[in-house]
C-alpha cells in the first residue's frame, strides 16, 4: 500500500524516529552554547522499503527507479518530515541569550 | 565551511540534480497516464559529506553524530530542497484530465 | 549610563488592561534579551518571561495568553501587556537585562526600580 | 513547568556564623541558575550566577555550588548586612523556555 507503516524488515527496522543522547563536545557546540549540557537528538533512522511511508509522487518514483536501476537511483532515504523546536542559552559577543532553533528535532519521519 | 558547495570528494560525486529519463512503464503509471509517454525524472544524488549542502541544524547535528558513531547514526542524505511541478494527461472515471504535481520533480537538493 | 525605568503602572480594574514599559539606556536592545520579574506585596519574586535580542519570546505558563512582551529598538523600550487583570496581579513589575541566570559581560545587576500595578474595583 | 524549591523558609543565625540555603529544581537545569538577594524596598540584587560564579562586587564570603536539580548557596559568616531574604532563580531550556524563582530564605539575626 502506498504510504504504508508496516515495515516488511521486521519491528524497527524501517524508518522510524529514534533519540541519541548527544554532550555538547560531541555536537562541536562547547565553545557556544551553555545550556543543554546535553541534548536527547530526535532522528529519522531507518530502511525505506517499497512505499513505506513515502513522502510524495517523488519517493513513489525513486521507489520505481530504484527497483530498476539500483546501481544508479538510490532507494529513498529517512528524514524528518517535521521539527520540535528547542531553545539554547547561547553566547554572544554582549553574554548570553536565548535562542529558538526550529529545525534541530526531528520530530516524525518519511521517506523521500 | 558550513552548507559549502565544494565537493570533497571529486567533482559530481556529492548531492546534485540528476535526470535519469523513464518510460510509463518504468514508473508504473502506464495504466493511468496517457502523457507524457517519457519523463526526464530530475532527482537528487550523491554523497554528503562533513557539511556539504547541510540543509539545516539538524543535518549539522547528523554530521556530527555519524562522525562519532558511523554504526549508529547515517550519514545525511542528498534529497529534494524544492520541487519543479509537472502536468500529466491522466485516464478518470469519465475520460482524460490534467493534472499538475507538484511535488514530482526535484528542483535543487540539499542534505539533510 | 546604562539604566532601566519601567513605567506605566498605577490602578486599574479587575478585567482590563495595562501596558508596562521599560526604557533602557545606554546598550542596545538588539543584543540583550530582557526579563520582566513581579512582586506581590508582601510576596515572593515572580518570573514572567523573557524577550530574546532577537524578538523571540518565553513566557512563565502561567502568563501565557494574558502576558505580551514585545519591544520597539528604535525605541530603546520593552513592553509588558497585561490583559484580563486580576487582584492577584497586583505588585510592583520589574524588567532586568539579561536571562539572570547566566551574567551579562559587562554590568552584572542590571534591574529597574520598579512600577507599581494595583488591580482593584 | 518548572518549579523552584528553596528551604528552609526562615533560617535564625547569630553573626560571624556560616548560613547554608538549599535550592531544588524540578527538572534538570544544568546550571541555569541565580540567587538573588533582596531588601525591603530594593530590586534584587544578584550574588551569583551559573550556579557557583561570584557576581562582580559581591563579597567572597558568599559561594554557590551545585548542578542538574540540587543547589546550595553558602554565607561563611555572616555580616549584619547579609540578613534580607535570599532567593534562587532556575531557567529551563528544551523545547521551550521558562524560569522560576524558589519561595525564598529569609535569613534573619538569631
Known amino acids: 500500500a502506498r504510504n504504508g507503516d508496516h515495515c516488511p524488515l521486521g519491528p524497527g527496522r524501517c524508518c522510524r524516529l529514534h533519540t541519541v543522547r548527544a554532550s555538547l563536545e560531541d555536537l562541536g557546540w562547547a565553545d557556544w552554547v551553555l545550556s543543554p549540557r546535553e541534548v536527547q537528538v530526535t532522528m529519522c533512522i531507518g530502511a525505506c522499503p517499497s512505499q513505506f511511508r513515502a513522502a510524495n509522487m517523488h519517493a513513489q518514483i525513486k521507489t520505481s527507479l530504484h527497483r530498476l536501476k539500483p546501481d544508479t537511483v538510490p532507494a529513498p532515504c529517512c528524514v524528518p518530515a517535521s521539527y520540535n523546536p528547542m531553545v539554547l542559552i547561547q553566547k554572544t559577543d554582549t553574554g548570553v541569550s536565548l535562542q529558538t532553533y526550529d529545525d534541530l528535532l526531528a520530530k516524525d519521519c518519511h521517506c523521500i | 565551511a558550513r552548507n559549502g558547495d565544494h565537493c570533497p570528494l571529486g567533482p559530481g560525486r556529492c548531492c546534485r540534480l540528476h535526470t535519469v529519463r523513464a518510460s510509463l512503464e518504468d514508473l508504473g503509471w502506464a495504466d493511468w497516464v496517457l502523457s507524457p509517454r517519457e519523463v526526464q525524472v530530475t532527482m537528487c544524488i550523491g554523497a554528503c559529506p562533513s557539511q556539504f549542502r547541510a540543509a539545516n541544524m539538524h543535518a549539522q547535528i547528523k554530521t556530527s553524530l555519524h562522525r562519532l558513531k558511523p554504526d549508529t547514526v547515517p550519514a545525511p542524505c542528498c534529497v529534494p530542497a524544492s520541487y519543479n511541478p509537472m502536468v500529466l494527461i491522466q485516464k478518470t472515471d469519465t475520460g482524460v484530465s490534467l493534472q499538475t504535481y507538484d511535488d514530482l520533480l526535484a528542483k535543487d537538493c540539499h542534505c539533510i | 549610563e546604562v539604566q532601566l525605568l519601567e513605567s506605566g503602572g498605577g490602578l486599574v480594574q479587575p478585567g482590563g488592561s495595562l501596558r508596562l514599559s521599560c526604557a533602557v539606556s545606554?546598550?542596545?536592545?538588539?543584543?540583550?534579551?530582557m526579563t520582566w520579574v513581579r512582586q506581590a506585596p508582601g510576596k515572593g519574586l515572580e518570573w514572567i518571561g523573557i524577550?530574546?535580542?532577537?524578538?523571540?519570546?518565553y513566557y512563565a505558563s502561567w502568563a501565557k495568553g494574558r502576558f505580551t512582551i514585545s519591544k520597539d529598538s528604535s525605541k530603546n523600550t520593552v513592553y509588558l501587556q497585561m490583559n484580563s487583570l486580576r487582584a492577584e496581579d497586583t505588585a510592583v513589575y520589574f524588567c532586568?537585562?539579561?536571562?539572570?541566570?547566566?551574567?551579562?559581560?559587562?554590568?552584572?545587576?542590571?534591574w529597574g526600580q520598579g512600577t507599581l500595578v494595583t488591580v482593584s474595583s | 513547568d518548572i518549579v523552584m524549591t528553596q528551604s528552609p523558609a526562615t533560617l535564625s543565625v547569630s553573626p560571624g556564623e556560616r548560613a547554608t540555603l538549599s535550592c531544588q529544581a524540578s527538572e534538570d537545569i544544568y546550571t541555569n541558575l541565580a540567587w538573588f538577594q533582596q531588601k525591603p524596598g530594593q530590586p534584587p540584587r544578584l550574588l551569583i550566577y551559573a550556579a557557583s560564579t561570584l557576581a562582580s562586587g559581591i563579597p567572597a564570603r558568599f559561594s554557590g555550588s551545585g548542578s542538574g536539580t540540587e543547589f546550595t548557596l553558602t554565607i561563611s559568616s555572616l555580616q549584619s548586612e547579609d540578613f534580607a531574604v535570599y532567593y534562587c532563580?532556575?531557567?529551563?531550556?528544551?523545547?521551550?523556555?521558562?524560569?522560576?524563582f524558589g519561595q525564598g530564605t529569609k535569613v534573619e539575626i538569631k
Open positions: 524577550i530574546s535580542g532577537s524578538g523571540s519570546t
Open positions: 532586568a537585562r539579561g536571562i539572570l541566570v547566566y551574567a551579562d559581560y559587562g554590568d552584572h545587576n542590571l
Open positions: 545606554g546598550f542596545s536592545l538588539s543584543s540583550y534579551d
Open positions: 532563580l532556575g531557567v529551563y531550556t528544551y523545547i521551550s523556555a521558562e524560569g522560576a
